[in-house]
């Protein structure tokens, strides 16, 4: 008789990452009988929701339902109908919503209420929407990349599953850059974590991890740009801001009210004699870098050493995976190769920022001008943050791996979040590996 396929014994999970600039929906899949194995969960779909982040819907909450429809319908298609009711859905909102909550807790609650109402209308097992903490965002990002890299597995492999894997059980640090915050998370080497707020203790698969993490609110790439503009306009002699972080010939009008809308610019707020100003790009990497450094207060440190703004940072240790906007920006700039030194990256950024705006627009005709115009700033910001903010050096730069996906799953906090909420990371090493599921009989 012919071999007959058995129904796959698999499970699914959905996580929505409600970031400051956009929302993405991720669908994960795993063999049901291997839930506690490391590395068995993988991403089968990513759906990017059209439109801005959910915090931008504060004055139009009635539009949230439509906004989420396409990606939720996509989830309905991808996941077999028979499994809809048992598929958990989690929504985690990050720094964009943390900032909205700082402005108005009531408005943030309203947005989340409407999100919850909308997501409850689907046939899945909706588990609620919440604003995750910066500490969680860092921790779950660290769990994700190390889970996908097989760092929690006790089995030693003779092969590498990814090109930059350092074939040992030393965990990777995690560097995450969003639009409104950035996270740094790693296991320091025999170092006391001097600040309790930055210390996490995990027991995963029978091993203890003492992890350092910090989330810098307002230091995501978009909010850092707003900060820089608010700082620089303070000393502008008129309503023209000659900005080294934009290409020569680039011009853009900015409303002062938009500049001061975010809590991130409050420290630079002042009464200006104009309602609008014009950014005029001059495209100078070095000057841009200097301007960005002024956002990092390094004059005060109550610990043995700090990153910036008085935040404890232990000495860097081991390899790091840099993902989210670290990866997207560096990928666009063609700087993600393992072989590109920090000096070469700096040189390429100098050349890129100096290119005239008209030339840039022609070279990258398919890229939205809003995004295209900010790559000079974003690339310079990434270098400034990693080198001066986190104290990477030309040597330790070689230990930074710009990662988009690991084995088909996006690097980011969502997988770690789901693994935790579905109790799929055991504290102890599972005693025995269950028999793998046979597809054919």
């Amino acid at each position: 008789t012919q071999n007959k396929a058995l129904p796959e014994n698999v499970k699914y999970g959905i996580v929505l990452d409600a970031g400051s600039s956009h929302t993405s929906l991720y669908i994960y899949k795993w063999p049901a009988e291997k839930e506690n194995d490391t590395g068995v969960v993988h991403q089968v779909e990513e759906c990017r929701v059209k439109g801005p982040g959910i915090s931008k819907f504060v004055q139009k909450v009635n539009e949230i339902g439509i906004y989420l429809t396409d990606c939720m319908e996509r989830a309905r298609e991808v996941i077999p109908r028979s499994q809809h009711q048992e598929t958990p859905v989690y929504l985690g909102a990050t720094a964009g919503m943390r900032l909205l909550r700082m402005e108005s807790e009531e408005l943030a609650d309203r947005v989340l209420d409407v999100v919850e109402t909308s997501l409850s209308n689907y046939p899945f097992d909706f588990q609620g929407a919440r604003i995750i903490t910066g500490q969680e965002e860092g921790a779950y990002g660290w769990i994700t990349i190390n889970y996908l890299l097989g760092k929690f597995s006790q089995k030693t492999r003779w092969f590498s599953i990814v090109p930059y894997e350092t074939n040992n059980q030393e965990t990777f640090g995690a560097l995450d850059l969003g639009g409104a915050s950035t996270q740094v998370t790693f296991v320091p080497q025999n170092q006391t974590i001097e600040s309790p707020d930055n210390a996490l203790q995990f027991r995963l698969y029978g091993k203890d991890y003492n992890v350092y993490t910090h989330s810098f609110l307002c230091y995501g790439k978009d909010q850092a740009l707003w900060q820089k503009l608010a700082k620089d306009i303070q000393v502008a002699s008129n309503e023209i801001l000659r900005d080294p972080c934009f290409h020569p010939g680039y011009k853009k009008v900015v409303n002062v009210s938009d500049l001061y809308k975010t809590p991130c610019t409050k420290r630079f707020e002042m009464t200006l004699p104009f309602q609008q100003f014009e950014i005029q790009g001059i495209g100078n990497y070095q000057q841009c870098h200097q301007s960005i450094l002024e956002l990092f207060n390094t004059s005060y440190c109550p610990y043995s050493q700090c990153a910036f703004n008085g935040i404890f940072l232990p000495p860097l240790q081991g390899d790091f995976g840099a993902f989210s906007a670290f990866y997207f920006v560096m990928k666009f700039l063609n700087l993600t190769s393992e072989k590109v030194s920090q000096e070469k990256v700096t040189e390429m950024m100098k050349k890129f920022c100096a290119q005239p705006w008209e030339e840039i627009k022609t070279s990258y005709a398919g890229v939205k001008e809003k995004y295209l115009s900010e790559y000079c700033f974003s690339g310079t910001y990434i270098l400034s943050l990693l080198l001066q903010g986190y104290h990477f050096t030309a040597d330790s730069w070689e230990h930074i791996h710009f990662i988009g996906k690991i084995q088909g799953s996006d690097a980011g906090w969502t997988l770690g979040y789901m693994l935790n909420l579905t109790n799929m990371i055991p504290a102890e090493q599972p005693l025995s590996t269950p028999l793998s599921h046979s597809t054919y009989v």
Epitope: E116, A129, R130
Partner: antibody, heavy 121, light 107 residues
Amino acid sequence: QVQLVQSGAEVKKPGASVKVSCKASGYTFKSYEMHWVRQAPGQGLEWMGRINPSVGSTWYAQKFQGRVTMTRDTSTSTVYMELSSLRSEDTAVYYCARGKREGGTEYLRKWGQGTLVTVSS
Amino acid sequence: EIVLTQSPGTLSLSPGERATLSCRASQSVASSYLAWYQQKPGQAPRLLIYGASNRHTGIPDRFSGSGSGTDFTLTISRLEPEDFAVYYCQQYHNAITFGGGTKVEIK
């Protein structure tokens, strides 16, 4: 819209227990903490404690520790407050009030209509 | 625990007048953790102000809150007939505590 509907008035004897319910609707039940506040006749407001409906964790005011138990039933979106060893000074209107989302601040946004508990021999 | 003392106990005013209610804490309270409630006879309290100065949804702009540290104030700029009620301040530090209340009555 958000509604908190409490159970009806109760008359109890000293030493007995009372269990007051508060049924929530119009929002995701697990997302907001629920608090209990009481008000003796002609007196001010007194906070008794709170419950996180998502995980069932509780936090009680010191005065009521050992005498109060707050529970929830997620299937019916209902929270309960049980007060034991009742005495005459427990005669009061008992209110449930919706608190914060995780990470928010502790103010009481929406209140139930109140349940009068009378303790009398 | 933090004790909140409200004064005056009773405030006798006419409609159209300005009411200023005080709430003093026994130790410093973060502004984000102070709220004001209004309660009318036979009704549940309702939230007016949170975070010391933020008006809750639907609360008229004649109600305003201010203050920091240990001294907080609720101001009703022009009393309307429906504003005559008891007002409570509330803080959160480790536990919630309420002030004793201020009754605003018609003169």
